[in-house]
Amino acid sequence: MMTGTIETTGNISAEKGGSIILQCHLSSTTAQVTQVNWEQQDQLLAICNADLGWHISPSFKDRVAPGPGLGLTLQSLTVNDTGEYFCIYHTYPDGTYTGRIFLEVLESSVAEHGARFQIP
């Protein structure tokens, strides 16, 4: 039975040209995390494999950085980066857990969000 839950940064906003950290956390399960995939609308951004480490999609390698932890840092944001992001935790023996984050990239300094997950 899948008992775990995913906590995410939820709905977040950031300024165009800036950076943002996407974070998910899996709790309430003793399942082993074998891999975490980060996707944006069915496009694979990055993989963190427990055995082989981080792999960043060649399409995003200039704007995506691994971490911190199992999170993902998006850099040089554009308005086209607005949308849904998913952290997909592949675990054993539970199976797959998915978290959702909605990112809105704003044109000006009207982006407001707690500094905990934002890089100045």
Epitope: T34, Q35, N37, E39, D42, Q43, L44, I47, N49, D51, L52, G53, H55, I56, S57, P58, K61, H90, T96
Partner: antibody, heavy 121, light 108 residues
Amino acid sequence: QVQLVQSGAEVKKPGASVKVSCKASGYTFPAYYMHWVRQAPGQGLEWMGIINPSLGLTSYARKFQGRVTMTRDTSTSTVYMELSSLRSEDTAVYYCARGGRTTWIGAFDIWGQGTMVTVSS
Amino acid sequence: EIVMTQSPATLSVSPGERATLSCRASQSVSSNLAWYQQKPGQAPRLLIYGASTRATGIPARFSGSGSGTEFTLTISSLQSEDFAVYYCQQYVVWPPLTFGGGTKVEIK
């Protein structure tokens, strides 16, 4: 040209170990993942594991964990797959296959010719 | 693990006809799917990667489509050398990377 050449057929007794080699040529050996896949007679393809030839990092299918060891020798561009505690169900053709670059993921574009391992008492 | 299911298990087709092979993933693999061809006594050969990109040297009669969980390999006009077993494979989540059970394309 790019190719993978595997060692010859083996006949082993139950409980023994086998070590199959796969020598790569024609490309930058450390830059691409190497996988091992096996195929029992008349059956489909079964992934066993992967090795990063540059760092030596490995990831094994849970089914084989504790029984399989994948290593590499960068000086000879060779990867090895050792399977221990052999049983009759391990009778199969074992293939090495080149995967994607170690910076990303990819399909298996180059395959070895296969090594037949027969386990019989 | 991601389970790959191929259908049909066997496909009987006449030379010159079109063959359509299906592959379904138990969860999304985006476009990280490959198709391989295997003839008796030979190692598999990569046909398609990225769900729809032909590998080097693969004839244009082979085409792949789909994304997410549903994928198709189409052979537009079967040649005698195309009768073989075809496998799909996801290569985005490991361990383990997983193959479908295969579709045997035989002469009708």
